[in-house]
């Protein structure tokens, strides 16, 4: 698997997003778990509805929640007020058994708020080509621009 | 095992700008964090900023917004901080500290500093 | 800012006390806190993290309480080794900040 970057802002909510086959794992509850280590499994923080059919119920663990949009195939994670100790690596999940299969990696990264962040010289928001290595890049930044500011780069 | 060599002391003249270098060892470079914080004689310690090797993001205290700038050098495991416009305020010892794995819940291995003076 | 209020700013024990350093955020950094230990010629040693968490290779008689806004380290049964500066640090939000530190030194 790939990891997919998913950078936000301290303070504002994050949308994470992962697709799968909506036919191959029909009936499958899902989960959003965290890697803490390089060792160790993937600590569970939140998880579908119990029932699959409600997985469209938004369900939430402390500041973090989860809905499942199991005809379209999407699993969407929100993590909402992102502080610093958010970031890290994370997986969404397709859990049949005791067994669960891992949908998407995602490292969440979670920045200093860049309305105080006026230097050009920073790496902010480096561009994706030359500074990601089997990564794709999601910036679920919103806000408008300062005057002069130069927008995110886009992503693919 | 984990070690963090940092470059060594420098003597600059106000005005001046200054990079220093943070050569991690015993472990994965892009997997880790890597923070600075900023020592003045005597004083406590002052998170400067972070950032994270595998994308190269930052955050900066707003503090030494302008006045520091944290790069990564992936091919070479080098992280390295610039400080510029240097005065007397800025003499101090600069430590890089590796945060967790791709987060920062604890700062586990510190460098041996790197002590920089500022004088005429 | 979350401010980091640190007391005492300096303690005099003997080896074997017990001795308690405290630690008092600005506002709530839930368990958000990391405290190290600072020795001349050494480079700084993260102790606990997570308010209570005993990192790995650190000794029992370390340990770590509170969330919140009120933290404690307690060092028991002091070894001579134990007479350093400690620090308490909180990663709640940023600017990550510190405490004014606290010098243990033997009586």
């Known amino acids: 698997h790939n990891t997919t970057v998913f950078q936000g802002v301290a303070g504002q909510s994050l949308q994470v997003s992962c697709p799968y086959d909506s036919m191959k794992h029909w009936g499958r509850r899902k989960a959003w778990c965290r890697q803490l280590g390089e060792k160790g499994p993937c600590q569970r923080v939140v998880s579908t509805h119990n029932l699959w059919l409600l997985s469209f119920l938004r369900r939430w663990n402390g500041s973090t929640a989860i809905t499942d949009d199991t005809l379209g195939g999407t699993l969407t994670i929100t993590l909402r007020n992102l502080q610093p100790h958010d970031a890290g690596l994370y997986q969404c999940q397709s859990l049949h058994g005791s067994e669960a299969d891992t949908l998407r990696k995602v490292l969440v990264e979670v920045l200093a708020d860049p309305l105080d962040h006026r230097d050009a010289g920073d790496l902010w928001f480096p561009g994706e080509s030359e500074s990601f290595e089997d990564a794709h890049v999601e910036h679920s930044i919103s806000r408008s621009l300062l005057e002069g500011e130069i927008p995110f780069p886009p992503t693919s | 095992e984990v070690q963090l060599q940092q470059s060594g002391p420098v003597l600059v003249k106000p005005g001046a700008s200054v990079r220093m270098s943070c050569k991690p060892s015993?472990?994965?470079?892009?997997?880790?964090?890597m923070n600075w914080v900023k020592q003045s004689h005597g004083k406590s310690l002052e998170w400067i900023g972070s950032?994270?090797?595998?994308?190269?993001?930052?955050s900066y205290n707003q503090n030494f917004r302008g006045k520091a700038t944290l790069t990564v050098d992936k091919s070479s495991s080098t992280a390295y901080m610039e400080l510029n416009s240097l005065t007397s305020e800025d003499s101090a010892v600069y430590y890089c500290?590796?945060?967790?794995?791709?987060?920062?819940?604890?700062?586990?291995?510190w460098g041996q500093g790197t002590l920089v003076t500022v004088s005429a | 800012d979350v401010q980091l209020t640190q007391s005492p700013s300096f303690l005099t024990a003997s080896p074997g006390e017990t001795i308690t350093i405290n630690c008092r955020a600005s506002?709530?950094?839930?368990?958000?806190l990391a405290w190290y230990q600072e020795k001349p010629g050494k480079t700084n040693k993260l102790l606990i993290s997570?308010?209570?968490t005993l990192q790995s290779g650190i000794p029992s008689r370390f340990s770590g309480s509170g969330s919140g806004t009120d933290f404690t380290l307690t060092i028991s049964s002091l070894e001579p080794e134990d007479f350093a500066m400690y620090y308490c640090?909180?990663?709640?939000?940023?600017?990550?900040?510190f405490g004014s530190g606290t010098k243990l030194e033997i009586k």
């Open positions: 640090q909180q990663y709640s939000e940023y600017p990550f900040t």
């Open positions: 506002k709530s950094i839930s368990k958000y």
């Open positions: 015993g472990y994965t470079f892009t997997d880790y964090y």
């Open positions: 500290a590796r945060g967790s794995y791709y987060s920062n819940l604890g700062f586990a291995y």
């Open positions: 997570s308010g209570s």
């Open positions: 950032i994270n090797p595998y994308t190269g993001g930052s």
